[in-house]
Interface confidence: low
């Protein structure tokens, strides 16, 4: 779509694939910037899609840590990075991959 892409400014989480479905970090995570960012006006909002470790990620622990990633900024923003699973919900792109 052009314009600034947060994934360009923040480091990739290597060897990780994101959750199968977009999901906010759990309440146990130290910091969720999505709670601090006001949703933008958008026809097709997306919740954040934090990464989860490979292989055989545990669906009960969608993020390998409570650490900050660019996905934490994606609340209310269409799209988002990350390759996900067969859920039928949310973002399914690998980290670092551009949409068509």
């Amino acid at each position: 779509d052009g314009g600034f892409d947060l994934s360009d400014a923040l480091p990739d989480n290597e060897n990780k694939k994101p959750t199968a479905i977009p999901k906010k970090p759990s309440a146990g995570d130290d910091f969720d910037l999505g709670d601090a960012v006001v949703d933008g006006e958008n026809d097709d909002p997306r919740p954040p899609n934090p990464p989860k470790p490979m292989p055989n990620p545990n669906p009960n622990h969608p993020s390998s840590s409570g650490s900050f990633s660019d996905a934490d900024l994606a609340d209310g923003v269409s799209g988002g990075e990350g390759k996900g699973g067969s859920d039928g919900g949310g973002s399914h792109r690998k980290e670092g991959e551009e949409a068509d």
Epitope: I21, K24, R46, G79, G85, D87, G89, K94, A99
Partner: antibody, heavy 120, light 112 residues
Framework: QVQLQQSGPGLVKPSQTLSLTCAIS??????????WNWIRQSPSRGLEWLGR?????????DYAVSVKSRITINPDTSKNQFSLQLNSVTPEDTAVYYC??????????WGQGTTVTVSS | NFMLTQPHSVSESPGKTVTISCTGS????????VQWYQQRPGSAPTTVIY?????PSGVPDRFSGSLDTSSNSASLTISGLRPEDEADYYC??????????FGGGTKVTVLS
């Protein structure tokens, strides 16, 4: 184990509204780790995804462009189910309609399917 | 519009191996997970492969999934073909808006 039980009429008249319901057992429609889809299948179109609803602190809906102007998918948390409404149907909407759950680390889990015929 | 293209049909004798391809029309097939569903006549689809190459419990290891980035395609391979494998098989992935996309389906016939 998640199971989806579909219900709704098998015959709808042209220009009317198709309404189907999918009752969920073994999971919650409000789950933060699931999405709830409607898919249809016809000989002419094959498998066609229609849309989904999912909850991530608030409810989200996504719809296929082909039906966006006339589809509504609603969750019903009190009954743990979700519904499909497709307005202004034509004979081209005749198909087998499936509800399906997507979740972490699995493929779609499908309902049993409901054959819907649009005819006067 | 992003599309997934599958061969209309494949056939092979029992005990042999069949491979079904699923080619993405644009972008990289590797940028989105691919699922495979088996559908027997009169039944709803069931998952045989999810997330490119993962098998659900209960699915025999005769079923395997893979990606080939050079041909921008995913493949489902069924080895040691059995009569009960006769069914339609659908690949599924996502477009650039994260919407679900299905392939057109491949009919697998087990020759007698």
């Amino acid at each position: 184990q998640v199971q989806l039980q579909q219900s709704g009429p098998g015959l709808v008249k042209p220009s009317q509204t198709l309404s189907l319901t999918c009752a969920i057992s073994g999971d919650s429609v409000s789950s933060n780790s699931a999405a709830w889809n409607w898919i249809r299948q016809s000989p002419s179109r094959g498998l066609e995804w229609l849309g989904r609803t999912y909850y991530r602190s608030k409810w989200y809906n996504d719809y296929a462009v082909s039906v966006k102007s006339r589809i509504t998918i609603n969750p019903d948390t009190s009954k743990n189910q979700f519904s499909l409404q497709l307005n202004s149907v034509t004979p081209e909407d005749t198909a087998v309609y499936y509800c399906a759950r997507g979740s972490y680390g699995s493929g779609l889990v499908w309902g049993q399917g409901t054959t819907v015929t649009v005819s006067s | 519009n992003f599309m997934l293209t599958q061969p209309h049909s494949v056939s092979e004798s029992p005990g042999k191996t069949v491979t079904i391809s699923c080619t993405g029309s644009s972008g990289s097939i590797a940028s989105n997970y691919v699922q495979w569903y088996q559908q027997r006549p009169g039944s709803a689809p069931t998952t045989v492969i999810y997330e490119d190459d993962q098998r659900p419990s209960g699915v025999p290891d005769r079923f395997s999934g893979s990606l080939d980035t050079s041909s921008n395609s995913a493949s489902l391979t069924i080895s040691g073909l059995r009569p009960e494998d006769e069914a339609d098989y659908y690949c599924q992935s996502y477009d650039n808006k994260d919407n679900v996309v299905f392939g057109g389906g491949t009919k697998v016939t087990v020759l007698s």
